[in-house]
Amino acid sequence: ASVATELRCQCLQTLQGIHPKNIQSVNVKSPGPHCAQTEVIATLKNGRKACLNPASPIVKKIIEKMLNSDKSN
């Protein structure tokens, strides 16, 4: 689930079994010149960044929940 910082795809691999409890925020990066795929990068409670699989149903649920809570705040 390493996250790179150069101007290319940041997610080299994604984590399986992510749980929403420790996710502080989620950054969804749309495809662009730097990377041809959607990337989902979560910031965990301890500050660590973790790449999530955007195709995973649970990740979609987490993103939806986060977006909804952002709207209500």
Partner: antibody, heavy 119, light 107 residues
Framework: QVQLQQSGAELVRPGSSVKISCKAS????????MNWVKQRPGQGLEWIGQ????????NYNGKFKGKGTLTADKSSSTAYMQLNSLTSEDSAVYFC????????????WGQGTSVTVSS | DIQMTQSPSSLSASLGGKVTITCKAS??????IAWFQHKPGKGPRLVIH???ILQPGIPSRFSGVGSGRDYSFSIRNLEPEDIATYYC?????????FGGGTKLEIK
């Protein structure tokens, strides 16, 4: 490597309190939730609660609210659980267990601390 | 709180054989189930998390499946060191709750 070393067995009187410890090594103690689990003799496992040493945030099983108090000392990388107003129902082995940051699975466990409440 | 009903409470199987343990949750737990192996005098050992993901170092003889409320855990090619009590744990919603345990014995 990650290790959780728990304090030794305790024999205590009914009505008294006991504080058991769990010393962590091999990882950033402040960055991971620490869970506590109870096992009575011949019984199954029961989740008591958890503490996040980084900000002292806690979650408790409602059943144990008022019975157990969770604290953590970042300087010594040690988590503590104090059990109050002890009765025979509190005689058990208590385990600490680290919760992994991304998937909350309890991946490392202490060896357990036996608490016997007897007059 | 979510209840986890684990069955059977004990079972006996032959070396080389296969066993299956089931856990039923009182509500959908979104695949957030873990399975632990517990031997006397030791701390429990994480075997599987998120329904089917094997913990590093655990042999592929162990497996898990399930979704919604129904989950199962299997061990094939049973070996003597598999003798233990096995517990499921739901961690979808706090408080985390364990199943009652299954004591595995070898015939």
């Amino acid at each position: 490597q990650v290790q959780l070393q728990q304090s030794g067995a305790e024999l205590v009187r009914p009505g008294s309190s006991v504080k058991i410890s769990c010393k962590a090594s091999g990882y950033a103690f402040s960055d991971y939730w620490m869970n506590w689990v109870k096992q009575r003799p011949g019984q199954g496992l029961e989740w008591i609660g958890q503490i996040y040493p980084g900000d002292a945030d806690t979650n408790y099983n409602g059943k144990f609210k008022g019975k157990g108090t969770l604290t953590a000392d970042k300087s010594s990388s040690t988590a503590y659980m104090q059990l109050n107003s002890l009765t025979s129902e509190d005689s058990a082995v208590y385990f600490c267990a680290r919760e992994r940051d991304y998937d909350v699975a309890m991946d490392y466990w202490g060896q357990g601390t036996s608490v016997t409440v007897s007059s | 709180d979510i209840q986890m009903t684990q069955s059977p409470s004990s079972l006996s199987a032959s070396l080389g054989g296969k066993v299956t343990i089931t856990c039923k949750a009182s509500q959908d737990i979104n695949k957030y189930i873990a399975w632990f192996q517990h031997k006397p005098g030791k701390g429990p050992r994480l075997v599987i998390h998120y329904t089917s993901i094997l913990q590093p170092g655990i042999p592929s003889r162990f497996s898990g499946v399930g979704s919604g409320r129904d989950y199962s855990f299997s061990i094939r090619n049973l070996e003597p060191e598999d003798i233990a009590t096995y517990y499921c744990l739901q961690y979808d919603n706090l408080p985390w709750t364990f199943g009652g345990g299954t004591k595995l014995e070898i015939k």
